[in-house]
Protein backbone atom coordinates (compact mmCIF):
# COMPACT_ATOMS: atom_id res chain seq x y z
CA UNK A 1 0.00 0.00 0.00
CA UNK A 2 1.22 3.84 -0.81
CA UNK A 3 2.40 6.08 2.03
CA UNK A 4 -0.02 8.38 3.41
CA UNK A 5 -0.51 11.76 1.85
CA UNK A 6 -2.27 14.41 3.60
CA UNK A 7 -4.31 16.09 0.98
CA UNK A 8 -5.15 19.77 1.16
CA UNK A 9 -7.50 20.65 -2.06
CA UNK A 10 -8.25 24.31 -1.47
CA UNK A 11 -4.82 26.46 -1.77
CA UNK A 12 -7.22 29.22 -0.20
CA UNK A 13 -10.59 30.04 1.18
CA UNK A 14 -11.86 33.69 1.27
CA UNK A 15 -14.60 33.85 4.24
CA UNK A 16 -16.73 36.97 5.33
CA UNK A 17 -15.81 38.50 8.95
CA UNK A 18 -18.92 36.38 11.21
CA UNK A 19 -19.23 33.94 8.69
CA UNK A 20 -17.58 29.60 9.21
CA UNK A 21 -14.82 28.00 7.45
CA UNK A 22 -14.14 25.48 5.80
CA UNK A 23 -11.06 23.91 5.58
CA UNK A 24 -10.73 20.74 3.23
CA UNK A 25 -8.46 17.81 4.42
CA UNK A 26 -8.45 14.26 3.83
CA UNK A 27 -5.77 11.46 3.68
CA UNK A 28 -5.13 8.76 1.36
CA UNK A 29 -4.47 6.15 3.82
CA UNK A 30 -5.90 4.76 7.03
CA UNK A 31 -2.17 3.90 8.21
CA UNK A 32 -0.62 4.55 10.42
CA UNK A 33 -2.37 4.90 13.11
CA UNK A 34 -2.25 8.07 14.73
CA UNK A 35 -4.49 11.71 15.41
CA UNK A 36 -4.59 14.73 13.05
CA UNK A 37 -4.10 18.02 14.62
CA UNK A 38 -4.46 21.54 12.52
CA UNK A 39 -2.18 24.35 12.89
CA UNK A 40 -2.13 27.85 11.94
CA UNK A 41 1.17 28.96 10.91
CA UNK A 42 4.51 26.51 10.25
CA UNK A 43 7.36 25.74 12.82
CA UNK A 44 8.19 25.89 16.05
CA UNK A 45 5.40 28.69 16.34
CA UNK A 46 2.98 27.43 15.00
CA UNK A 47 -0.86 27.61 16.96
CA UNK A 48 -2.40 24.64 17.53
CA UNK A 49 -6.26 25.20 16.31
CA UNK A 50 -7.46 21.28 16.38
CA UNK A 51 -6.14 18.23 17.97
CA UNK A 52 -8.25 14.67 17.10
CA UNK A 53 -7.02 13.29 20.39
CA UNK A 54 -7.49 15.68 22.97
CA UNK A 55 -8.41 19.46 24.34
CA UNK A 56 -11.56 21.37 23.91
CA UNK A 57 -11.71 23.47 20.48
CA UNK A 58 -15.22 25.34 21.15
CA UNK A 59 -15.15 27.26 17.67
CA UNK A 60 -14.38 23.81 15.53
CA UNK A 61 -16.58 21.41 14.18
CA UNK A 62 -15.05 18.54 12.29
CA UNK A 63 -16.86 17.45 9.01
CA UNK A 64 -17.03 13.68 9.50
CA UNK A 65 -16.99 11.84 12.71
CA UNK A 66 -13.25 11.68 13.53
CA UNK A 67 -13.84 8.68 16.24
CA UNK A 68 -13.83 5.74 13.39
CA UNK A 69 -11.04 4.10 12.73
CA UNK A 70 -11.79 4.14 8.85
CA UNK A 71 -12.36 7.71 8.90
CA UNK A 72 -10.21 9.69 6.03
CA UNK A 73 -11.84 13.10 6.12
CA UNK A 74 -9.96 15.56 8.63
CA UNK A 75 -11.95 18.79 7.56
CA UNK A 76 -12.95 21.12 9.91
CA UNK A 77 -15.42 24.19 10.12
CA UNK A 78 -14.18 27.31 12.08
CA UNK A 79 -17.07 29.53 13.16
CA UNK A 80 -17.76 32.64 13.81
CA UNK A 81 -14.42 33.87 11.64
CA UNK A 82 -12.89 37.26 12.67
CA UNK A 83 -9.86 39.13 10.60
CA UNK A 84 -7.61 37.68 13.56
CA UNK A 85 -8.04 34.05 12.00
CA UNK A 86 -6.39 34.74 8.72
CA UNK A 87 -3.19 32.76 8.14
CA UNK A 88 -2.37 29.93 6.53
CA UNK A 89 -3.82 26.31 8.19
CA UNK A 90 -1.91 22.95 7.90
CA UNK A 91 -3.43 19.45 8.19
CA UNK A 92 -0.66 17.16 9.99
CA UNK A 93 -1.05 13.24 10.30
CA UNK A 94 0.90 11.94 13.13
CA UNK A 95 1.51 8.31 14.27
CA UNK A 96 0.67 6.80 17.98
CA UNK A 97 4.01 6.69 19.74
CA UNK A 98 4.99 7.44 23.41
CA UNK A 99 5.98 9.50 25.50
CA UNK A 100 4.59 11.81 22.50
CA UNK A 101 2.94 11.51 18.89
CA UNK A 102 5.64 11.75 15.93
CA UNK A 103 4.39 13.70 13.38
CA UNK A 104 4.08 11.90 10.16
CA UNK A 105 3.22 14.11 6.80
CA UNK A 106 1.46 17.75 6.25
CA UNK A 107 -0.90 18.98 4.16
CA UNK A 108 0.10 21.99 2.14
CA UNK A 109 -1.32 24.68 4.07
CA UNK A 110 -4.85 26.04 3.02
CA UNK A 111 -4.57 30.36 3.37
CA UNK A 112 -7.27 31.32 5.23
CA UNK A 113 -8.54 35.09 3.53
CA UNK A 114 -10.86 37.26 5.70
CA UNK A 115 -13.21 39.45 4.19
CA UNK A 116 -13.71 42.39 6.84
CA UNK A 117 -15.75 45.59 6.53
CA UNK A 118 -14.44 48.66 7.28
CA UNK A 119 -15.98 50.27 10.45
CA UNK A 120 -18.30 53.43 9.50
CA UNK A 121 -16.06 56.32 8.41
CA UNK A 122 -15.66 58.68 11.29
CA UNK A 123 -15.09 62.37 10.48
CA UNK A 124 -13.59 65.03 12.66
CA UNK A 125 -12.62 68.54 11.94
CA UNK A 126 -10.12 71.64 13.40
CA UNK A 127 -10.18 71.90 17.23
CA UNK A 128 -11.51 75.60 16.42
CA UNK A 129 -13.31 77.78 14.50
CA UNK A 130 -11.89 79.16 11.05
CA UNK A 131 -13.10 82.19 9.72
CA UNK A 132 -14.15 82.16 5.31
CA UNK A 133 -11.04 82.20 3.17
CA UNK A 134 -9.43 80.32 5.28
CA UNK A 135 -8.22 76.51 4.50
CA UNK A 136 -9.37 73.72 7.19
CA UNK A 137 -8.47 70.17 7.35
CA UNK A 138 -10.69 67.41 7.74
CA UNK A 139 -9.73 63.36 8.93
CA UNK A 140 -11.50 60.32 8.26
CA UNK A 141 -10.80 57.10 9.51
CA UNK A 142 -11.86 53.63 9.28
CA UNK A 143 -10.82 50.43 10.74
CA UNK A 144 -11.03 46.88 10.59
CA UNK A 145 -11.13 45.80 6.95
CA UNK A 146 -9.74 43.32 5.04
CA UNK A 147 -8.33 42.73 2.33
CA UNK A 148 -6.49 45.93 1.76
CA UNK A 149 -7.30 47.34 -1.14
CA UNK A 150 -10.04 50.32 -0.67
CA UNK A 151 -11.42 53.78 -2.26
CA UNK A 152 -11.98 56.90 -0.30
CA UNK A 153 -13.36 59.93 -1.93
CA UNK A 154 -14.07 63.24 0.18
CA UNK A 155 -17.07 65.27 -1.04
CA UNK A 156 -17.84 69.04 -0.53
CA UNK A 157 -21.75 69.26 -0.84
CA UNK A 158 -21.94 66.26 -3.66
CA UNK A 159 -18.66 68.01 -5.31
CA UNK A 160 -15.49 65.96 -5.36
CA UNK A 161 -12.60 67.47 -3.79
CA UNK A 162 -9.24 66.64 -4.62
CA UNK A 163 -6.51 68.21 -2.56
CA UNK A 164 -6.39 65.35 0.01
CA UNK A 165 -3.82 62.50 1.44
CA UNK A 166 -4.94 59.33 2.56
CA UNK A 167 -2.94 56.55 3.82
CA UNK A 168 -3.69 52.88 4.56
CA UNK A 169 -2.21 50.90 7.82
CA UNK A 170 -0.09 48.64 8.02
CA UNK A 171 2.13 48.75 5.22
CA UNK A 172 2.75 45.31 5.25
CA UNK A 173 0.42 42.08 5.72
CA UNK A 174 -1.81 42.21 8.25
CA UNK A 175 -5.20 40.51 9.77
CA UNK A 176 -7.07 43.80 9.46
CA UNK A 177 -6.11 47.21 8.04
CA UNK A 178 -7.01 51.26 8.66
CA UNK A 179 -7.37 53.90 6.46
CA UNK A 180 -6.94 57.46 7.57
CA UNK A 181 -7.50 60.67 5.43
CA UNK A 182 -6.86 63.86 5.43
CA UNK A 183 -8.50 66.82 3.24
CA UNK A 184 -8.22 70.44 3.15
CA UNK A 185 -11.22 72.22 2.68
CA UNK A 186 -11.27 76.18 1.99
CA UNK A 187 -14.01 77.81 3.56
CA UNK A 188 -16.60 80.42 2.41
CA UNK A 189 -19.22 82.60 3.94
CA UNK A 190 -21.92 80.27 2.43
CA UNK A 191 -21.13 77.21 4.00
CA UNK A 192 -22.76 77.21 7.49
CA UNK A 193 -24.92 74.89 5.58
CA UNK A 194 -22.25 72.78 4.18
CA UNK A 195 -21.23 69.53 4.47
CA UNK A 196 -18.26 67.59 4.14
CA UNK A 197 -18.35 63.60 3.69
CA UNK A 198 -16.02 61.25 3.65
CA UNK A 199 -17.11 57.92 1.39
CA UNK A 200 -15.70 54.75 1.51
CA UNK A 201 -15.57 51.94 -0.93
CA UNK A 202 -14.69 48.18 -0.49
CA UNK A 203 -15.41 45.01 -1.84
CA UNK A 204 -17.20 43.76 1.41
CA UNK A 205 -20.07 46.48 0.82
CA UNK A 206 -20.55 45.24 -2.52
CA UNK A 207 -21.17 48.70 -4.11
CA UNK A 208 -22.78 50.67 -1.13
CA UNK A 209 -19.67 52.46 0.23
CA UNK A 210 -20.08 53.82 3.56
CA UNK A 211 -20.44 57.26 4.45
CA UNK A 212 -19.31 59.90 7.36
CA UNK A 213 -20.01 63.62 7.60
CA UNK A 214 -19.06 66.87 9.14
CA UNK A 215 -21.39 69.94 9.44
CA UNK A 216 -19.41 73.12 8.48
CA UNK A 217 -21.12 74.32 10.84
CA UNK A 218 -19.63 72.92 13.87
CA UNK A 219 -16.11 74.66 11.85
CA UNK A 220 -16.57 77.93 10.41
CA UNK A 221 -17.03 81.27 12.08
CA UNK A 222 -18.50 84.09 10.04
CA UNK A 223 -17.82 87.61 11.41
CA UNK A 224 -20.88 89.90 11.24
CA UNK A 225 -20.83 93.30 9.40
CA UNK A 226 -21.60 96.32 11.98
CA UNK A 227 -23.75 99.00 10.39
CA UNK A 228 -24.66 102.08 12.92
CA UNK A 229 -27.22 104.68 11.52
CA UNK A 230 -28.53 107.30 12.81
CA UNK A 231 -33.19 107.20 12.61
CA UNK A 232 -35.19 110.34 12.13
CA UNK A 233 -36.31 111.89 15.92
CA UNK A 234 -38.60 110.16 17.71
CA UNK A 235 -39.60 113.05 19.91
CA UNK A 236 -37.76 116.28 20.12
CA UNK A 237 -34.19 116.00 22.07
CA UNK A 238 -34.14 112.43 21.25
CA UNK A 239 -32.38 110.82 18.45
CA UNK A 240 -32.50 106.81 17.88
CA UNK A 241 -29.35 105.14 16.96
CA UNK A 242 -29.51 101.51 15.63
CA UNK A 243 -26.59 99.20 15.34
CA UNK A 244 -27.25 96.34 12.91
CA UNK A 245 -25.22 93.10 12.87
CA UNK A 246 -25.11 90.78 9.76
CA UNK A 247 -24.46 87.68 8.25
CA UNK A 248 -22.53 86.35 11.67
CA UNK A 249 -22.47 82.51 12.78
CA UNK A 250 -22.26 80.91 15.39
CA UNK A 251 -25.12 82.83 17.14
CA UNK A 252 -22.88 83.55 20.18
CA UNK A 253 -22.74 87.33 20.29
CA UNK A 254 -22.82 90.24 22.72
CA UNK A 255 -23.00 93.87 22.18
CA UNK A 256 -22.18 96.97 23.89
CA UNK A 257 -22.69 100.78 23.39
CA UNK A 258 -20.45 103.49 24.56
CA UNK A 259 -21.03 107.16 24.82
CA UNK A 260 -17.75 108.76 24.37
CA UNK A 261 -16.21 105.61 25.45
CA UNK A 262 -18.09 104.79 28.24
CA UNK A 263 -20.16 102.18 28.44
CA UNK A 264 -23.70 102.99 27.98
CA UNK A 265 -25.45 99.31 27.59
CA UNK A 266 -24.35 95.53 27.08
CA UNK A 267 -26.82 92.94 25.82
CA UNK A 268 -26.59 89.54 24.35
CA UNK A 269 -28.33 88.36 21.11
CA UNK A 270 -30.85 86.83 21.76
CA UNK A 271 -34.09 87.33 18.99
CA UNK A 272 -32.13 86.86 15.87
CA UNK A 273 -32.98 86.70 12.40
CA UNK A 274 -31.90 83.75 10.29
CA UNK A 275 -30.81 84.24 6.78
CA UNK A 276 -31.15 82.06 3.95
CA UNK A 277 -26.92 80.81 3.96
CA UNK A 278 -27.64 80.07 7.78
CA UNK A 279 -26.27 83.08 9.30
CA UNK A 280 -28.12 85.77 11.38
CA UNK A 281 -29.00 89.06 12.18
CA UNK A 282 -29.65 90.78 14.79
CA UNK A 283 -30.53 95.05 15.44
CA UNK A 284 -29.74 96.76 18.48
CA UNK A 285 -30.93 100.22 19.05
CA UNK A 286 -29.95 103.32 21.54
CA UNK A 287 -31.90 106.33 22.52
CA UNK A 288 -29.92 109.39 22.94
CA UNK A 289 -31.64 111.89 25.07
CA UNK A 290 -29.49 114.90 23.30
CA UNK A 291 -30.28 117.64 25.79
CA UNK A 292 -28.35 115.90 27.94
CA UNK A 293 -24.89 116.41 26.20
CA UNK A 294 -23.28 120.39 25.90
CA UNK A 295 -20.89 118.66 23.22
CA UNK A 296 -21.04 115.97 20.25
CA UNK A 297 -21.25 112.32 21.36
CA UNK A 298 -19.82 109.52 19.58
CA UNK A 299 -21.73 106.98 19.88
CA UNK A 300 -19.73 103.33 19.09
CA UNK A 301 -21.46 99.79 18.36
CA UNK A 302 -18.82 97.22 19.90
CA UNK A 303 -19.03 93.48 19.05
CA UNK A 304 -17.60 90.37 20.49
CA UNK A 305 -18.45 87.43 18.80
CA UNK A 306 -18.26 83.93 19.13
CA UNK A 307 -15.43 84.94 22.32
CA UNK A 308 -13.26 86.71 19.38
CA UNK A 309 -11.76 90.21 19.70
CA UNK A 310 -14.15 93.23 19.71
CA UNK A 311 -14.97 94.74 16.44
CA UNK A 312 -16.82 98.25 16.60
CA UNK A 313 -18.38 101.00 14.44
CA UNK A 314 -18.89 104.42 15.55
CA UNK A 315 -21.03 107.30 14.96
CA UNK A 316 -20.86 110.97 15.85
CA UNK A 317 -24.13 112.87 16.50
CA UNK A 318 -23.87 116.51 16.32
CA UNK A 319 -25.68 118.04 19.12
CA UNK A 320 -24.69 121.19 19.04
CA UNK A 321 -28.26 121.74 16.89
CA UNK A 322 -30.29 121.50 19.81
CA UNK A 323 -31.15 123.32 22.84
CA UNK A 324 -29.61 122.31 26.09
CA UNK A 325 -32.02 120.92 29.11
CA UNK A 326 -30.19 122.13 32.40
CA UNK A 327 -30.37 120.07 35.17
CA UNK A 328 -30.96 116.56 33.43
CA UNK A 329 -29.07 113.86 35.40
CA UNK A 330 -30.79 110.71 32.52
CA UNK A 331 -28.04 111.11 29.27
CA UNK A 332 -29.54 108.19 27.49
CA UNK A 333 -32.58 106.05 27.09
CA UNK A 334 -31.13 102.45 26.14
CA UNK A 335 -33.39 100.33 24.38
CA UNK A 336 -32.66 96.87 22.87
CA UNK A 337 -35.03 95.98 19.80
CA UNK A 338 -37.94 94.14 21.57
CA UNK A 339 -37.30 95.65 25.02
CA UNK A 340 -38.76 98.17 27.51
CA UNK A 341 -37.67 101.10 27.82
CA UNK A 342 -35.07 101.82 30.53
CA UNK A 343 -34.36 104.91 32.66
CA UNK B 1 -25.72 -3.51 13.37
CA UNK B 2 -22.24 -4.12 13.75
CA UNK B 3 -21.49 -7.55 14.85
CA UNK B 4 -18.57 -9.68 15.41
CA UNK B 5 -19.21 -13.69 15.33
CA UNK B 6 -16.77 -16.17 16.54
CA UNK B 7 -16.54 -19.39 16.00
CA UNK B 8 -14.25 -22.71 15.42
CA UNK B 9 -13.25 -23.18 19.15
CA UNK B 10 -13.38 -26.75 20.68
CA UNK B 11 -11.09 -29.64 22.49
CA UNK B 12 -7.80 -30.16 20.70
CA UNK B 13 -4.85 -32.09 22.01
CA UNK B 14 -1.40 -30.65 22.79
CA UNK B 15 0.42 -29.93 19.93
CA UNK B 16 -2.57 -29.79 17.50
CA UNK B 17 -4.02 -27.20 15.15
CA UNK B 18 -7.27 -25.12 14.95
CA UNK B 19 -8.91 -22.27 12.85
CA UNK B 20 -11.25 -19.81 14.13
CA UNK B 21 -13.05 -17.89 12.15
CA UNK B 22 -14.81 -14.20 13.21
CA UNK B 23 -17.71 -12.91 11.04
CA UNK B 24 -18.10 -9.24 10.72
CA UNK B 25 -21.20 -7.62 9.82
CA UNK B 26 -22.43 -4.12 9.91
CA UNK B 27 -19.79 -2.62 8.84
CA UNK B 28 -16.80 -2.05 6.11
CA UNK B 29 -14.92 -4.88 7.31
CA UNK B 30 -11.68 -4.32 5.28
CA UNK B 31 -11.10 -0.62 6.85
CA UNK B 32 -10.42 -1.34 10.23
CA UNK B 33 -7.55 -3.31 11.85
CA UNK B 34 -9.12 -6.34 13.48
CA UNK B 35 -7.54 -8.18 16.35
CA UNK B 36 -7.34 -11.59 18.80
CA UNK B 37 -7.57 -11.25 22.38
CA UNK B 38 -7.82 -14.28 24.87
CA UNK B 39 -9.27 -15.02 28.03
CA UNK B 40 -8.28 -18.41 30.64
CA UNK B 41 -10.76 -19.38 32.87
CA UNK B 42 -10.57 -16.92 35.76
CA UNK B 43 -7.73 -14.99 34.53
CA UNK B 44 -7.22 -11.70 33.06
CA UNK B 45 -7.70 -10.99 29.37
CA UNK B 46 -4.09 -11.33 26.81
CA UNK B 47 -3.76 -9.49 23.62
CA UNK B 48 -3.07 -12.22 20.69
CA UNK B 49 -2.65 -11.14 17.77
CA UNK B 50 -3.54 -8.02 15.19
CA UNK B 51 -4.18 -7.84 11.60
CA UNK B 52 -3.84 -4.31 9.63
CA UNK B 53 -6.17 -2.90 7.08
CA UNK B 54 -3.22 -3.50 4.88
CA UNK B 55 -2.15 -7.00 6.32
CA UNK B 56 0.79 -6.26 8.72
CA UNK B 57 0.41 -8.56 11.47
CA UNK B 58 2.28 -8.31 15.39
CA UNK B 59 1.93 -10.92 17.69
CA UNK B 60 3.03 -11.33 21.31
CA UNK B 61 5.90 -13.42 22.18
CA UNK B 62 3.76 -15.85 23.87
CA UNK B 63 2.05 -16.53 20.34
CA UNK B 64 4.79 -15.70 18.14
CA UNK B 65 5.67 -18.44 15.22
CA UNK B 66 2.51 -20.76 16.43
CA UNK B 67 -0.17 -18.43 15.59
CA UNK B 68 -0.98 -17.10 12.49
CA UNK B 69 -3.43 -14.27 11.72
CA UNK B 70 -5.02 -13.55 8.27
CA UNK B 71 -8.18 -11.95 6.81
CA UNK B 72 -10.85 -12.07 3.89
CA UNK B 73 -11.96 -9.17 3.12
CA UNK B 74 -14.40 -9.94 0.22
CA UNK B 75 -15.80 -12.48 3.09
CA UNK B 76 -15.86 -10.22 5.64
CA UNK B 77 -13.51 -12.70 7.40
CA UNK B 78 -11.14 -12.90 10.34
CA UNK B 79 -9.34 -15.90 11.07
CA UNK B 80 -6.45 -17.32 13.67
CA UNK B 81 -4.42 -20.22 12.67
CA UNK B 82 -3.18 -21.79 15.94
CA UNK B 83 -0.53 -24.56 15.38
CA UNK B 84 1.45 -26.60 18.04
CA UNK B 85 -1.13 -25.82 20.66
CA UNK B 86 -0.49 -26.20 24.15
CA UNK B 87 -2.49 -26.39 27.36
CA UNK B 88 -1.49 -22.95 28.08
CA UNK B 89 -3.49 -21.70 24.75
CA UNK B 90 -6.26 -23.13 27.00
CA UNK B 91 -8.80 -20.08 26.81
CA UNK B 92 -11.98 -17.93 25.59
CA UNK B 93 -10.66 -16.43 22.25
CA UNK B 94 -12.04 -13.42 21.19
CA UNK B 95 -12.12 -11.09 18.20
CA UNK B 96 -12.34 -6.80 18.07
CA UNK B 97 -12.43 -4.62 15.93
CA UNK B 98 -10.04 -1.81 16.57
CA UNK B 99 -12.72 0.30 15.72
CA UNK B 100 -11.55 3.81 16.79
CA UNK B 101 -9.19 6.34 15.29
CA UNK B 102 -6.17 5.71 17.18
CA UNK B 103 -7.36 1.95 17.17
CA UNK B 104 -8.93 1.27 20.71
CA UNK B 105 -11.19 -1.56 20.63
CA UNK B 106 -14.83 -0.79 20.24
CA UNK B 107 -16.67 -3.82 19.28
CA UNK B 108 -16.12 -7.47 20.67
CA UNK B 109 -17.20 -11.11 19.70
CA UNK B 110 -18.75 -13.21 22.26
CA UNK B 111 -16.40 -15.64 21.94
CA UNK B 112 -15.51 -19.09 21.03
CA UNK B 113 -13.80 -21.59 23.73
CA UNK B 114 -10.29 -23.53 23.12
CA UNK B 115 -9.70 -26.38 24.75
CA UNK B 116 -6.32 -28.05 24.73
CA UNK B 117 -6.07 -31.35 26.15
CA UNK B 118 -4.95 -34.87 26.32
CA UNK C 1 6.64 -5.56 26.76
CA UNK C 2 4.94 -2.52 28.77
CA UNK C 3 3.24 -4.05 32.31
CA UNK C 4 0.22 -2.66 33.19
CA UNK C 5 -1.44 -2.96 37.04
CA UNK C 6 -4.24 -2.35 38.29
CA UNK C 7 -5.31 -1.77 42.35
CA UNK C 8 -6.72 -2.25 44.24
CA UNK C 9 -7.26 -6.22 42.56
CA UNK C 10 -10.80 -6.11 44.67
CA UNK C 11 -13.38 -3.91 45.60
CA UNK C 12 -16.37 -3.62 47.89
CA UNK C 13 -19.23 -0.66 47.46
CA UNK C 14 -22.60 0.08 47.53
CA UNK C 15 -25.22 1.24 45.19
CA UNK C 16 -24.72 5.25 45.03
CA UNK C 17 -20.98 5.01 45.88
CA UNK C 18 -18.00 6.91 43.69
CA UNK C 19 -15.42 4.46 43.28
CA UNK C 20 -12.18 4.82 41.44
CA UNK C 21 -9.90 2.33 40.01
CA UNK C 22 -6.34 2.78 39.43
CA UNK C 23 -4.10 1.60 36.49
CA UNK C 24 -0.07 2.49 36.45
CA UNK C 25 2.15 1.36 33.42
CA UNK C 26 5.67 0.21 33.48
CA UNK C 27 6.46 3.28 30.94
CA UNK C 28 4.76 6.21 29.29
CA UNK C 29 1.96 5.47 27.16
CA UNK C 30 1.09 9.01 26.27
CA UNK C 31 -2.76 8.84 27.16
CA UNK C 32 -3.41 5.43 25.07
CA UNK C 33 -5.19 3.77 27.55
CA UNK C 34 -8.54 1.78 27.04
CA UNK C 35 -11.07 0.66 30.18
CA UNK C 36 -12.97 -2.81 29.76
CA UNK C 37 -15.98 -4.05 31.85
CA UNK C 38 -16.43 -8.04 31.77
CA UNK C 39 -19.25 -9.22 34.08
CA UNK C 40 -18.95 -13.22 34.24
CA UNK C 41 -19.41 -15.31 31.31
CA UNK C 42 -19.74 -12.39 29.12
CA UNK C 43 -17.33 -10.41 26.47
CA UNK C 44 -16.15 -7.46 27.29
CA UNK C 45 -17.08 -4.33 26.55
CA UNK C 46 -15.83 -1.29 25.98
CA UNK C 47 -16.19 1.87 27.84
CA UNK C 48 -13.20 4.34 27.78
CA UNK C 49 -10.29 5.16 24.87
CA UNK C 50 -7.57 8.12 25.29
CA UNK C 51 -7.91 7.81 28.91
CA UNK C 52 -11.04 9.94 28.66
CA UNK C 53 -13.15 9.36 25.58
CA UNK C 54 -16.68 7.38 26.17
CA UNK C 55 -17.45 4.65 23.64
CA UNK C 56 -20.73 5.14 21.87
CA UNK C 57 -23.47 4.69 24.27
CA UNK C 58 -21.55 4.37 27.18
CA UNK C 59 -23.52 6.58 29.69
CA UNK C 60 -21.42 9.67 31.31
CA UNK C 61 -20.95 8.58 34.90
CA UNK C 62 -18.13 6.63 33.64
CA UNK C 63 -15.23 8.72 33.48
CA UNK C 64 -11.31 8.28 32.94
CA UNK C 65 -8.08 10.66 33.43
CA UNK C 66 -4.39 10.40 33.55
CA UNK C 67 -1.40 10.74 31.50
CA UNK C 68 1.73 9.34 30.99
CA UNK C 69 1.95 6.70 33.41
CA UNK C 70 -1.02 6.88 35.79
CA UNK C 71 -4.82 6.68 34.79
CA UNK C 72 -7.81 6.81 36.80
CA UNK C 73 -11.04 5.06 35.98
CA UNK C 74 -14.49 6.59 38.03
CA UNK C 75 -18.29 5.47 38.72
CA UNK C 76 -19.72 8.52 40.21
CA UNK C 77 -22.79 6.95 41.11
CA UNK C 78 -23.18 2.91 41.45
CA UNK C 79 -25.80 1.17 40.09
CA UNK C 80 -26.28 -2.76 40.43
CA UNK C 81 -25.31 -3.27 36.73
CA UNK C 82 -21.95 -1.98 37.54
CA UNK C 83 -20.82 -4.66 39.96
CA UNK C 84 -18.49 -6.10 37.37
CA UNK C 85 -14.90 -6.71 36.71
CA UNK C 86 -12.43 -3.94 35.58
CA UNK C 87 -9.80 -4.11 33.18
CA UNK C 88 -7.51 -1.54 31.31
CA UNK C 89 -5.36 -1.69 28.46
CA UNK C 90 -2.25 0.13 27.14
CA UNK C 91 -2.73 0.00 22.85
CA UNK C 92 0.62 2.81 21.98
CA UNK C 93 2.64 -0.02 20.84
CA UNK C 94 2.58 -3.44 20.30
CA UNK C 95 2.11 -6.38 22.02
CA UNK C 96 -0.97 -4.30 23.39
CA UNK C 97 -1.34 -5.53 27.50
CA UNK C 98 -4.23 -5.67 30.13
CA UNK C 99 -3.86 -4.89 33.75
CA UNK C 100 -4.83 -7.47 36.14
CA UNK C 101 -8.60 -6.52 36.68
CA UNK C 102 -10.35 -5.22 39.43
CA UNK C 103 -13.62 -6.80 40.66
CA UNK C 104 -15.81 -5.00 41.81
CA UNK C 105 -18.45 -6.34 44.34
CA UNK C 106 -21.38 -4.98 46.29
CA UNK C 107 -20.52 -5.00 49.81
Known amino acids: EEELQVIQPDKSVLVAAGETATLRCTATSLIPVGPIQWFRGAGPGRELIYNQKEGHFPRVTTVSDLTKRNNMDFSIRIGNITPADAGTYYCVKFRKGSPDDVEFKSGAGTELSVRAKPSAPVVSGPAARATPQHTVSFTCESHGFSPRDITLKWFKNGNELSDFQTNVDPVGESVSYSIHSTAKVVLTREDVHSQVICEVAHVTLQGDPLRGTANLSETIRVPPTLEVTQQPVRAENQVNVTCQVRKFYPQRLQLTWLENGNVSRTETASTVTENKDGTYNWMSWLLVNVSAHRDDVKLTCQVEHDGQPAVSKSHDLKVSAHPKEQGSNTAAENTGSNERNIY | EVQLVESGGGLVQPGGSLRLSCAAS????????MHWVRQATGKGLEWVSV???????YYPGSVKGRFTISRENAKNSLYLQMNSLRAGDTAVYYC????????????WGQGTMVTVSS | DIQMTQSPSSLSASVGDRVTITCRAS??????LAWFQQKPGKAPKSLIY???SLQSGVPSKFSGSGSGTDFTLTISSLQPEDFATYYC?????????FGQGTKLEIK
Open chain 2, 96 to 107: ARGGNWDDAFDI
Open chain 2, 26 to 33: GFTFSSYD
Open chain 2, 51 to 57: IGISGDT
Open chain 3, 27 to 32: QDINNY
Open chain 3, 50 to 52: TTS
Open chain 3, 89 to 97: QQYVSYPYT
